[in-house]
C-alpha cells in the first residue's frame, strides 16, 4: 500500500516553481454534439510533445511542455521538437505518466485561436504555438482549477440551463469536473466560445460523471450518453473543408458505383 501511495504521489503532484499543481484525473465531461476548449491553461498544465506519423521527438528532447510562471508572467517551459523517423514509421505515445493513468485530454490541432484578454490572465498560459511536424491531436494534462468552455458543434443549437463550462475541482482528496449546463439540439445554429467570461460555479457533478484519484480501486464509468459525441476538438475551417471534401468524394464514389451498376444491369438484360 505504501508503494502504491508513493506512486500516486509522484503521479499527481508536479513540482512547479513556488507551488504544487494537482493533476485532474480523467477528461472534462462529454456533452453530446458539443466540444470544449480551454481559453487559457493554468500553471502546472502539461502538453505532450507529440509528433505526426513519420516523425519522432528529437533525442534528449522534452517529453512535454509545462506551463510555469512567476508572479507576473506565465509561459510554456521546454520546447517540443520533432525530427524525421529514419527507423519505423510509428508515432511514439509520449505521456509523463504510465499508460494506465487516464490523464489524456485531446484537442485537435488548430491555429491558436486566442482571445486577447487571455494574454494578461495571471497564472495562466496561452495556447502554445504549433511546432514543426506536430501531431494532429494535442494531449493536455489539466490541473485543479482549470476551466473549459463548451460550444455546440455546427448544426446544433445550444440550450443553456446554466454556465456552459466545466471546472476541475478537488474535494475530499479526489478531483472531478463539474457538469456543464448545456444541451445541444439539432437545429442549424452554433454557439460561440466566450471571448471573456467570468468564472462561475457550475452545479455539482456526481459520481456518474466524475473522477477520483488516490486509492481508487475501480475505474469510473462515465455513464453520460456518448451517442454522436464529438472528440474534444475544435472545428476549424480546415477541418470543415476536409469533411466537405470527404463527403464530396463519398457522393462521387456512390454516383459512379450507381452508374456502373446500371450499365451492368443493361448488359445483363441484353444477354438474356
Amino acid at each position: 500500500m505504501d508503494s502504491y501511495l508513493l506512486m500516486w504521489g509522484l503521479l499527481t503532484f508536479i513540482m512547479v516553481p513556488g507551488c504544487q499543481a494537482e493533476l485532474c484525473d480523467d477528461d472534462p465531461p462529454e456533452i453530446p454534439h458539443a466540444t470544449f476548449k480551454a481559453m487559457a491553461y493554468k500553471e502546472g498544465t502539461m502538453l505532450n510533445c507529440e509528433c505526426k506519423r513519420g516523425f519522432r521527438r528529437i533525442k534528449s528532447g522534452s517529453l512535454y511542455m509545462l506551463c510555469t510562471g512567476n508572479s507576473s508572467h506565465s509561459s510554456w517551459d521546454n520546447q517540443c521538437q520533432c525530427t524525421s523517423s529514419a527507423t519505423r514509421n510509428t508515432t511514439k505515445q509520449v505521456t509523463p505518466q504510465p499508460e494506465e493513468q487516464k490523464e489524456r485530454k485531446t484537442t485537435e490541432m488548430q491555429s491558436p485561436m486566442q482571445p486577447v484578454d487571455q494574454a494578461s490572465l495571471p497564472g495562466h498560459c496561452r495556447e502554445p504555438p504549433p511546432w514543426e511536424n506536430e501531431a494532429t491531436e494535442r494531449i493536455y494534462h489539466f490541473v485543479v482549477g482549470q476551466m473549459v468552455y463548451y460550444q455546440c458543434v455546427q448544426g446544433y443549437r445550444a440550450l443553456h440551463r446554466g454556465p456552459a463550462e466545466s471546472v476541475c475541482k478537488m474535494t475530499h482528496g479526489k478531483t472531478r469536473w463539474t457538469q456543464p449546463q448545456l444541451i445541444c439540439t439539432g437545429e442549424m445554429e452554433t454557439s460561440q466560445f466566450p471571448g471573456e467570461e467570468k468564472p462561475q460555479a457550475s452545479p455539482e457533478g456526481r459520481p456518474e460523471s466524475e473522477t477520483s484519484c488516490l486509492v481508487t480501486t475501480t475505474d469510473f464509468q462515465i455513464q453520460t450518453e456518448m451517442a454522436a459525441t464529438m472528440e474534444t476538438s475544435i472545428f476549424t475551417t480546415e477541418y470543415q473543408v476536409a469533411v466537405a471534401g470527404c463527403v464530396f468524394l463519398l457522393i462521387s464514389v456512390l454516383l459512379l458505383s450507381g452508374l456502373t451498376w446500371q450499365r451492368r444491369q443493361r448488359k445483363s438484360r441484353r444477354t438474356i
Partner: antibody
Framework: QVQLVQSGAEVKKPGASVKVSCKAS????????MHWVRQAPGQGLEWMGW????????NSAQKFQGRVTMTRDTSINTAYMELSRLRSDDTAVYYC???????????WGQGTMVTVSS | DFQMTQSPSTLSASVGDRVTITCRAS??????LAWYQQKPGKAPKLLIY???SLKSGVPSRFSGSESGTEFTLTISSLQPDDFATYYC????????FGQGTKVEIK
C-alpha cells in the same frame, strides 16, 4: 424522504472485525459518494474514507488503510464499512454520510455504536 | 497534513447573544469548508457549506464567512435550540474536522 439507516450496535473483542451497514433511501444511491466518519466517546469527528457507489471505487484516510474495507450493494442501496483488527480505541459511533450539497455531508445516518472490549 | 484549529473549545452565551466561532486552516483550502451542529446522542447536521452557503431549511441567523485561511460561523441571535456542539470541516484535501466548539448556556 432522503435518509440513511444504519445497522444496530455491536460489541466486539480486540482483534475481531466489525461490518456496519448503511441503507440509503429517497434518492439515487449511485449518484452520490458515501463517506464514513467516526466519533469516539466525548471526542470529535474523524473522517475514515469514501466509496463511490456507482463504481465501487474507494479511498480511505491513511490512518485506516489496510484495516478498513468499504463496499456497496447497489441492488439494495446499501453501503458497508468493515473495520478489521479492532482495538479498544476503535470504540466509537460510526456514521455514514452522503456527500451532497456543495460536496459537504448533507445527510447522515443515525450512527452505529461499536464497542471493542475484552 | 491539514490541521483545522477551531476556537474557542467552549463558549458560554445567553439567548439573544451574537456568537462567533472561528476555524483556521493550516493551509489554503479554497472555500471547501462546512459547519455542522451536533446535539448529544445525535448525528451532526449540516448548516453551512462552501464556507458561506446556507443549507436550505437552516435558519438565516446562521452565517458563514471566510478571510484567507480563517473561517467564521456566526449565530446572529442565539436561540434555545442552538445550544450544541459545532464543528468545522475542511474537505479540500481529504476531510479534516475541527476539534469542536461547545456552546453552552451562561
Amino acid at each position: 424522504q432522503v435518509q440513511l439507516v444504519q445497522s444496530g450496535a455491536e460489541v466486539k473483542k480486540p482483534g475481531a472485525s466489525v461490518k456496519v451497514s448503511c441503507k440509503a433511501s429517497g434518492y439515487t444511491f449511485t449518484g452520490y459518494y458515501m463517506h464514513w466518519v467516526r466519533q469516539a466517546p466525548g471526542q470529535g469527528l474523524e473522517w475514515m474514507g469514501w466509496i463511490n457507489p456507482n463504481s465501487g471505487g474507494t479511498n480511505s484516510a491513511q490512518k485506516f488503510q489496510g484495516r478498513v474495507t468499504m463496499t456497496r450493494d447497489t441492488s439494495i442501496n446499501t453501503a458497508y464499512m468493515e473495520l478489521s483488527r479492532l482495538r479498544s480505541d476503535d470504540t466509537a459511533v460510526y456514521y455514514c454520510a452522503r456527500e451532497g450539497e456543495g460536496d459537504a455531508f448533507d445527510i447522515w445516518g443515525q450512527g452505529t455504536m461499536v464497542t471493542v472490549s475484552s | 497534513d491539514f490541521q483545522m484549529t477551531q476556537s474557542p473549545s467552549t463558549l458560554s452565551a445567553s439567548v439573544g447573544d451574537r456568537v462567533t466561532i472561528t476555524c483556521r486552516a493550516s493551509q489554503s483550502i479554497s472555500s471547501w469548508l462546512a459547519w455542522y451542529q451536533q446535539k448529544p446522542g445525535k448525528a451532526p447536521k449540516l448548516l453551512i457549506y462552501e464556507a458561506s452557503s446556507l443549507k436550505s431549511g437552516v435558519p438565516s441567523r446562521f452565517s458563514g464567512s471566510e478571510s484567507g485561511t480563517e473561517f467564521t460561523l456566526t449565530i446572529s441571535s442565539l436561540q434555545p435550540d442552538d445550544f450544541a456542539t459545532y464543528y468545522c470541516h475542511q474537505y479540500n484535501s481529504y476531510s479534516t474536522f475541527g476539534q469542536g466548539t461547545k456552546v453552552e448556556i451562561k
